[in-house]
C-alpha cells in the first residue's frame, strides 16, 4: 500500500531514579541509545496493524516506547492499555517526523502487558502494538568468582558461574593499603579472564552482570611485610578451591620459598612457583599453594618459608556452611545535636556479606571494611542527627543477621498543644523524655504559677515516629479551670518549653508558645 506511512518503533532505556508511574510524554530524560524494535506489518490482521518486537524490562527499570511517523500532515493518537485510554501528545522532531512516546517509569508487574497506539493521519488510520513484559530475573545468579590455574601456563583463570554470563575483570594494584581503593589511580583493571602478571601487591577478580558485582581477592602472604598482630585467617566452604599466594622480594635471586601445612611439605601438584626480576636485579618470587576442591582435612596452618625471610602463616578454616558472627543485641545511643557519631557493626563472615542500613523505611548503601584481625566493620554515619531506630541487615548465601540501634538526640523539649471540649493535650519530642507541669493563669496567679495536679494524665512514649518516642500530657477539663488560660510545660535536663491554652471551646487555638531555657 503506497499510502502507508514510514514508521519506526524504538525502545529507550533510561538511567533515571524517578518514582512516578507510566505516562504518555515527550519530555527528555537521561537515556541510553535507542534500540530499534522493528515494527513490521502484522499479516492477516483486520486493518493496518504494526507489531513491534517484544520488549523485556527489568523490574524498576524506566523505559520509553517511541514511534516516529514519516507521514505528511498532522496526526492524532490514542494509547490504550488494559482497556484504558491514555492521553497521547504527538510532537514533531527536527526532520518533521511525528513523534509519539509512552514513558514507563519504575516498571512493575501491573505495567506489563500490551500497549496499543492508534494513530490517525490525514491519509490513513493504523495501529501499533507493543508487548512489554518483565524480564524473569528469578533465574539470574551472580556467583563469587574463583581461580583456576591455566593448563600448561603460569597464569590464573577467573571463573564466575553466573547467569547471564558475567563480565570478568581483574583489578590490580601495586600500592599498599588505602591507595588500592577501587577508584584510585594506582588501580589497573583488565577485562579478561586470564591473568599472567601475578606479581602485583593486590590482585582481585570481579564478575558483574545485571545482578551486580562480586569480587574475590587472591589471598596473599607477603614475607617482606611485617606480619599482622593476629594470624590472617581464610575461610572456605567444603568443595571450594583454595588459593594462597606467598610473595617475597630479595636483593638477588639467591633464595627459595616453600609451603607447609601443619609442618608437612605440600604435595607436588599443590603448588607452583613463579619469579621475576624487578629493577636492580632484585628478585620477586611467588609460590602458590592451591587445592582444587577443599575438604575438611585441608584445614590448618599454612606456612610459607624462605631461606632469606622470616616465615609467615595463615590459618585456613574449612566450614560446611557459611556464617555471620556478630553480637545481635540492640544498642542505644544518645548524642548531642551536633556531635559526630557513627553506628558500627563488627562481624566475621564467610562468604562476604551483602548489607543495608535502614532508617524510617529507607535503605542506605552499606560499606564494609576488612580489619587486620580477620573481622570486618560496617559504619553508618549518614543519620543526619535524626533520632529513631536504625537497622543493620546482612546476609550471605547461608546466613542472615539483623541488628537494631536506637539513636536519641539530646535536646530541650518542643511543645505542641491541642484541645477538645473535654480536655487539653500537650506533646513533646525532646530527649531525655520530658516531665510535665500544668499551671493555671488567673487573677490570683497572673504569672501562671498556680500548679494544677488534678485531672492530669501523663503518657510517656505514647507515639513512636520511626523509633522516635513522643511524650504527652493530657489535662481533663473541670469546672474549676473552664474559661481559664492554662500553661503546660515540658522540661528535661536541657531546658523547658511551655504552651498556653485557653480552655473555653474546642477547635484550633491561637496557642502562645513560651520557650524557657
Amino acid at each position: 500500500n503506497q499510502d502507508l506511512p514510514v514508521i519506526k518503533c524504538v525502545l529507550i532505556n533510561h538511567k533515571n531514579n524517578d518514582s512516578s508511574v507510566g505516562k504518555s510524554s515527550s519530555y527528555p530524560m537521561v537515556s541510553e541509545s535507542p534500540e530499534d524494535l522493528g515494527c513490521a506489518l502484522r499479516p492477516q490482521s483486520s486493518g493496518t496493524v504494526y507489531e513491534a518486537a517484544a520488549v523485556e524490562v527489568d523490574v524498576s527499570a524506566s523505559i520509553t516506547l517511541q514511534v516516529l511517523v514519516d507521514a505528511p500532515g498532522n496526526i492524532s493518537c490514542l494509547w490504550v492499555f488494559k482497556h484504558s485510554s491514555l492521553n497521547c501528545q504527538p510532537h514533531f522532531d527536527l526532520q518533521n517526523r511525528g513523534v509519539v512516546s509512552m514513558v514507563i517509569l519504575k516498571m512493575t508487574e501491573t505495567q506489563a502487558g500490551e500497549y496499543l497506539l492508534f494513530i490517525q493521519s490525514e491519509a490513513t488510520n493504523y495501529t501499533i502494538l507493543f508487548t512489554v513484559s518483565i524480564r524473569n530475573t528469578l533465574l539470574y545468579t551472580l556467583r563469587r568468582p574463583y581461580f583456576r590455574k591455566m593448563e600448561n601456563q603460569d597464569a590464573l583463570v577467573c571463573i564466575s558461574e553466573s547467569v547471564p554470563e558475567p563480565i570478568v575483570e581483574w583489578v590490580l594494584c601495586d600500592s599498599q593499603g588505602e591507595s588500592c581503593k577501587e577508584e584510585s589511580p594506582a588501580v589497573v583493571k583488565k577485562e579478561e579472564k586470564v591473568l599472567h602478571e601475578l606479581f602485583g601487591t593486590d590482585i582481585r577478580c570481579c564478575a558483574r552482570n545485571e545482578l551486580g558485582r562480586e569480587c574475590t581477592r587472591l589471598f596473599t602472604i607477603d614475607l617482606n611485610q611485617t606480619p599482622q598482630t593476629t594470624l590472617p585467617q581464610l575461610f572456605l566452604k567444603v568443595g571450594e578451591p583454595l588459593w594462597i599466594r606467598c610473595k617475597a622480594v630479595h636483593v638477588n635471586h639467591g633464595f627459595g620459598l616453600t609451603w607447609e601445612l601443619e609442618n608437612k611439605a605440600l604435595e607436588e601438584g599443590n603448588y607452583f612457583e613463579m619469579s621475576t626480576y624487578s629493577t636492580n636485579r632484585t628478585m620477586i618470587r611467588i609460590l602458590f599453594a592451591f587445592v582444587s576442591s577443599v575438604a575438611r582435612n585441608d584445614t590448618g596452618y599454612y606456612t610459607c618459608s624462605s631461606s632469606k625471610h622470616p616465615s609467615q602463616s595463615a590459618l585456613v578454616t574449612i566450614v560446611e556452611k557459611g556464617f555471620i558472627n556478630a553480637t545481635n543485641s540492640s544498642e542505644d545511643y544518645e548524642i548531642d545535636q551536633y556531635e559526630e557519631f557513627c553506628f558500627s557493626v563488627r562481624f566475621k563472615a564467610y562468604p562476604q556479606i551483602r548489607c543495608t542500613w535502614t532508617f524510617s523505611r529507607k535503605s542506605f548503601p552499606c560499606e564494609q571494611k576488612g580489619l587486620d584481625n580477620g573481622y570486618s566493620i560496617s559504619k553508618f554515619c549518614n543519620h543526619k542527627h535524626q533520632p529513631g531506630e536504625y537497622i543493620f541487615h546482612a546476609e550471605n548465601d547461608d546466613a542472615q543477621f539483623t541488628k537494631m540501634f536506637t539513636l536519641n538526640i539530646r535536646r530541650k523539649p518542643q511543645v505542641l498543644a491541642e484541645a477538645s471540649a473535654s480536655q487539653a493535650s500537650c506533646f513533646s519530642d525532646g530527649y531525655p523524655l520530658p516531665s510535665w507541669t500544668w499551671k493555671k493563669c488567673s487573677d490570683k496567679s497572673p504569672n501562671c504559677t498556680e500548679e494544677i495536679t488534678e485531672g492530669v494524665w501523663n503518657r510517656k512514649a505514647n507515639r513512636k515516629v520511626f523509633g522516635q518516642w513522643v511524650s504527652s500530657s493530657t489535662l481533663n477539663m473541670s469546672e474549676a479551670i473552664k474559661g481559664f488560660l492554662v500553661k503546660c510545660c515540658a522540661y528535661n535536663s536541657l531546658g523547658t518549653s511551655c504552651e498556653t491554652i485557653l480552655l473555653n471551646s474546642p477547635g484550633p487555638f491561637p496557642f502562645i508558645q513560651d520557650n524557657i531555657s
Epitope: 603460569d154 599472567h196 606479581f199 636483593v251 638477588n252 635471586h253 639467591g254 613463579m274 619469579s275 621475576t276 626480576y277 624487578s278 629493577t279 636492580n280 636485579r281
Partner: antibody, heavy 117, light 110 residues
C-alpha cells in the same frame, strides 16, 4: 632452545643514532624470571655492560652512557632494541644482546657496528 | 677503567692449575653474586660459573669458583690448549645499580 639474533646497520655516521634489534626465538621475551641486556666489546678490548630491561619495563643503564642510551622491548614482536644517540668513533664495537637470570645464559652472536663518516 | 679489576693475563703449562682473581668492593662483589665467562676468539661469551661457585650443566669440573669478602676467584685445573681464551668476571653494583664486567684476563697455555 632459545636463540638471540642482533640486527642493524653495520656502519653509522658520527653524531647519528645507532639502532639495533635483537630478535628472540625459541622462547618469549615476556617470560618471567629473566631480564634482557646489551653488552658491547670494542676491538681488542673487554666486555662493557650497556644496560638492561626488566619484564616490568624498568631499565638500568651504564652511567657513562645513560644520557645517550634507550633500551626497550616490543613484546608482540619478541624483540629487544637498543638506541645509542650522538655516536662517535669510540662507540665502534661488537654489540651483543643477552638474556640474564642467575647469569647470562643466552647470547647473540654479536654484530659489529662501525662509526665512521 | 673498570671498578672490578682482573689481572690482564695469566699463563701456565698444559695440565697445570691456574687461578684468576677478580677484585671489587663491598657494594659489588662483597654483597652480590659473581659469575665467570669464557670468551674464545671471535665468539660470544659463555658462562662457566654463576652464583660464586655453581657450575651450569655441561661445564667440566676442572672449572671452579669461590668468593671471599670483596674478591672472587676462578680456578682451572688440568689446563688444556683449548682453554686459551679471555676470562671475565661479572657482578652487580648495588650502589651504582649497574652490572659490571671485570677488565678481562687473557689465559695463555704455554
Amino acid at each position: 632452545q632459545v636463540q638471540l639474533q642482533e640486527s642493524g646497520p653495520g656502519l653509522v655516521k658520527p653524531s647519528q643514532t645507532l639502532s639495533l634489534t635483537c630478535t628472540v626465538s625459541g622462547g618469549s621475551i615476556s617470560s618471567s624470571g629473566y631480564y634482557w641486556s646489551w653488552v658491547r666489546q670494542s676491538p681488542g678490548k673487554g666486555l662493557e655492560w650497556i644496560g638492561e630491561i626488566y619484564q616490568s619495563g624498568n631499565t638500568n643503564y651504564n652511567p657513562s652512557l645513560k644520557s645517550r642510551v634507550t633500551i626497550s622491548v616490543d613484546k608482540p614482536k619478541n624483540q629487544l632494541s637498543l638506541k645509542l644517540g650522538s655516536v662517535t668513533a669510540a662507540d665502534t664495537a661488537v654489540y651483543y644482546c643477552a638474556r640474564g637470570g642467575s647469569y647470562y645464559d643466552y647470547w647473540g652472536q654479536g654484530t659489529l657496528v662501525t662509526v665512521s663518516s | 677503567q673498570s671498578v672490578v679489576t682482573q689481572p690482564p693475563s695469566v699463563s701456565a703449562a698444559p695440565g697445570q692449575k691456574v687461578t684468576i682473581s677478580c677484585s671489587g668492593s663491598n657494594s659489588n662483589i662483597g654483597n652480590n653474586y659473581v659469575s665467570w665467562y669464557q670468551q674464545l676468539p671471535g665468539t660470544a661469551p659463555k658462562v662457566l660459573i654463576y652464583d660464586n661457585n655453581v657450575r651450569p650443566s655441561g661445564i667440566p669440573d676442572r672449572f671452579s669458583g669461590s668468593k671471599s669478602g670483596t674478591s672472587a676467584t676462578l680456578g682451572i685445573t688440568g689446563l688444556q690448549t683449548g682453554d686459551e681464551a679471555d676470562y671475565y668476571c661479572e657482578t652487580w653494583d648495588s650502589s651504582l645499580n649497574v652490572g659490571m664486567f671485570g677488565g678481562g684476563t687473557q689465559l695463555i697455555v704455554l
